[in-house]
């Protein structure tokens, strides 16, 4: 008896690998036997030359060559995506539509995300060669080659994880040239060759000198502050250096820097900072208004040095980035005493040459300002009548006055003469910070 069509075999996702045709299967039941029609991305296929599709009597679709590809930026398709095929089976009782099957083409791009780097490892210690393969469809697998031959992975000693090769315990025999190979059905790509040198462990308490390495610190440049770092960024410099020496360069570089002391003075200790670069890097954590000495030291495992030449850089003074602390107002005899503590040292941004004190002005004290020179941290202001006295204090460097303190106010509730005669438990005044 007659029955509507039913899809028995749905087309499957496929990778077009050529050179032969790709086949998409579709089988349907129904009475009368249904006719099969194919659609690509919802559009019926004409099957008329030059259309590269051909329909076999059993309903199988042959794709003789890949159709024109979508563009990578059409919001829908990478250039690997040839489209979604569906088949329709129809008779007079109805139509059945199959699941969609995606046809794609194999691709392997050329650019590695991460290339393995030359390195020096120490016998018995762990080391890692990093590799990030190019984009590929299907996703490529990574294998490692050593000295032109596939690396025989030893369980417990070698691990390949996320493309990277982890060597649990370096042996002298691990020395050689390593290459990462990315492979998929489109082919394979080879990374650059990375030279791995293996050193014997040293028993010295002092780090071993990398005597063969020569390092020249070429440039120290003050970086423009990043506006995204806010209105008061700490200074940073850009160090660039050149290395000459053996085939295996250092694994890391450390900046050594210190503030320059007066000639003949005892040098400050060198601060150390690991640098994120092999020829140049940013170094932060500095202070404005200081003269700095910089040098760079290479290291590999426990081996290190020698240090580069020393370069000098004077960082300009900036205005202090914090106000004086603990500003207080105290009543005197016909005067008010203002005292404060300097801003924290890391906010000086230079040499503090003095302080600026402002009165905010009201009925008791007209607007005014005073300059306190040198290291003095107090000021006496004459008062003539009861009322409110409010002041702010700012530290001054060669670049000018910095951020003022929050206003501090003293309320003199009665004339000073009475205040001295009748002291109460709290005094005749109140201190408030606005």
């Amino acid at each position: 008896q007659d029955s509507p069509p039913q899809i028995l075999v749905h087309p499957q996702d496929q990778l077009f690998q050529g050179p032969g045709p790709a086949r998409m299967s579709c089988q349907a039941s129904g009475q009368p036997p249904p006719t099969i029609r194919w659609l690509l991305n919802g559009q019926p296929l004409s099957m008329v030359p030059p259309d590269p599709h051909h329909l076999l009597p059993d309903g199988t679709l042959l794709l003789l060559q890949p159709p024109a590809r979508g563009h990578a930026h059409d919001g829908q398709a990478l250039s690997t995506d040839l489209g979604v095929y569906t088949c329709e089976a129809s008779n007079r009782l109805g139509t059945a539509v199959s699941r969609g099957a995606r046809l794609s083409v194999a691709v392997l791009r050329e650019d590695f995300q991460i290339q393995p780097r030359d390195m020096v490892a120490v016998v018995g210690e762990q080391f890692t060669l990093e590799c990030g393969p190019p984009w590929g469809h299907p996703e490529p697998t990574v294998s490692w080659w050593k000295d032109g031959k596939p690396l025989a992975l030893q369980p417990g000693r070698h691990t390949v994880s996320g493309g990277s090769l982890l060597m649990a315990r370096a042996e002298k025999s691990d020395e050689g040239t390593y290459m990462c190979v990315a492979t998929n059905s489109a082919g394979h790509r080879e990374s650059r060759a990375a030279r791995v040198s293996i050193q014997e462990p040293q028993d010295y308490t002092e780090p071993v000198e990398l005597l063969a390495v020569r390092i020249q610190l070429e440039n120290v440049t003050l970086l423009n502050p990043d506006p995204a770092e806010g209105p008061k960024p700490r200074p940073a410099v850009w160090l660039s250096w050149k290395v000459s020496g053996p085939a295996a360069p250092a694994q890391s570089y450390t900046a050594l820097f210190r503030t320059q002391t007066a000639p003949g003075g005892q040098g400050a200790p060198w601060a150390e900072e690991l640098l994120a670069g092999w020829q140049s890097a940013e170094l932060g954590g500095l202070h404005w208004g200081q003269d700095y000495e910089f040098k760079v030291r290479p290291s590999s495992g426990r081996a290190r040095g020698p240090d580069s030449n020393v370069l000098l850089l004077r960082l300009p003074e900036k205005v202090p980035s914090a106000p004086p602390q603990e500003v207080t107002l105290k009543p005197g005899n016909g005067t008010v005493f203002v005292s404060w503590v300097p801003p924290p040292a890391e906010n000086h941004n230079g040499i503090i040459r003095g302080y600026q004190v402002w009165s905010l002005g009201n009925t008791s004290l007209p607007p005014a300002n005073w300059t306190v020179v040198g290291e003095q941290t107090q000021l006496e202001i004459a008062t003539h009548m009861p009322g409110s006295y409010c002041v702010q204090v700012a530290a001054v460097t060669g670049a000018g006055a910095g951020e003022p303190s929050r206003p501090v106010c003293l309320l003199l509730e009665q004339a000073m003469e009475r205040a001295t005669q009748e002291p109460s438990e709290h005094g005749p005044w109140t201190l408030e910070q606005l």
Epitope: A72, H73, G75, Q76, L78, T80, D81, R102, S104, R109, E110, D111, Q113, I114, Q115, G132, P133, P134, W135, H137, P138, E139, G162, G163, R192, Q279, S280
Partner: antibody, heavy 118, light 112 residues
Framework: EVQLVESGGGLVQPGGSLRLSCAAS????????MSWVRQAPGKRLEWVAT????????YYPDSVKGRFTISRDNAKNTLYLQMNSLRAEDTAVYYC???????????WGQGTLVTVSS | DIVMTQSPLSLPVTLGEPASISCRSS???????????LNWYLQKPGQSPQLLIY???NRFSGVPDRFSGSGSGTDFTLKISRVEAEDVGVYYC?????????FGPGTKVDIK
């Protein structure tokens, strides 16, 4: 139409953990590499993580390496970012974005805010 | 890491006039295969970033042809031939040649 919708943001204490999700639709998720990018208030954009289309290869900057893990579930068309040992400086709007090969981020989600504060 | 810098950081523009933003990298963005992965994005106020230019000079679909990108090595430029009101926002360059990928600090474009 390509759509990316992030979720899972919120307030968390320093040292705490959070898991962000990004639901993808309108494209074949399993053929695209994906990334997370963040933007701290008033600051520049910062790349946080990238994962290959099959999830085998992952990439991170040093600032999050060892603390953040990017992963994906291609059956659910979802991208994840597991964030552990959170710090105040991780406070940002986190965006998920689709990658064309490893060449460029073409579509971005609307972002989800993560605040790390005690 | 590659440090990206942009100039100017703020760009007041006149409607209908051209505008130009520079992006510099601390190392060449051309890789060993000769490919350069430098992209430009616009982040309009309160929105997510949107792609304008990929691989130095290719306009993304739907991006008006008044936007163009150029450059090589370490110096790159985004040009807007005639600024329109909808072009205001922060423009970022992004390099994806070297891991870690890094953005520029952004250039804020607004109408005079």
């Amino acid at each position: 139409e390509v759509q990316l919708v992030e979720s899972g943001g919120g307030l968390v204490q320093p040292g705490g953990s959070l898991r962000l999700s990004c639901a993808a639709s309108g494209f074949t998720f399993s053929t695209y590499a994906m990334s997370w990018v963040r933007q701290a208030p008033g600051k520049r954009l910062e790349w946080v993580a990238t994962i290959s289309q099959g999830g085998t290869y992952t990439y991170y900057p040093d600032s999050v390496k060892g603390r953040f893990t990017i992963s994906r579930d291609n059956a659910k068309n979802t991208l994840y970012l597991q964030m552990n040992s959170l710090r105040a400086e991780d406070t940002a709007v986190y965006y998920c974005a689709r990658l064309i090969y490893y060449d460029y981020l073409d579509y971005w989600g609307q972002g989800t805010l993560v605040t790390v504060s005690s | 890491d590659i440090v990206m810098t942009q100039s100017p950081l703020s760009l007041p523009v006149t409607l209908g006039e051209p505008a130009s933003i520079s992006c510099r990298s601390s190392q060449s963005l051309e890789n060993s295969n000769g490919n350069t992965y430098l992209n430009w994005y616009l982040q309009k106020p309160g929105q997510s970033p949107q792609l304008l230019i990929y691989r130095v000079s290719n306009r993304f679909s739907g991006v008006p042809d008044r936007f163009s990108g150029s450059g090589s090595g370490t110096d790159f430029t985004l040009k807007i031939s005639r600024v329109e009101a909808e072009d205001v926002g922060v423009y970022y360059c992004l390099q994806v040649t070297h891991v870690p990928w890094t953005f520029g600090p952004g250039t804020k474009v607004d109408i005079k």
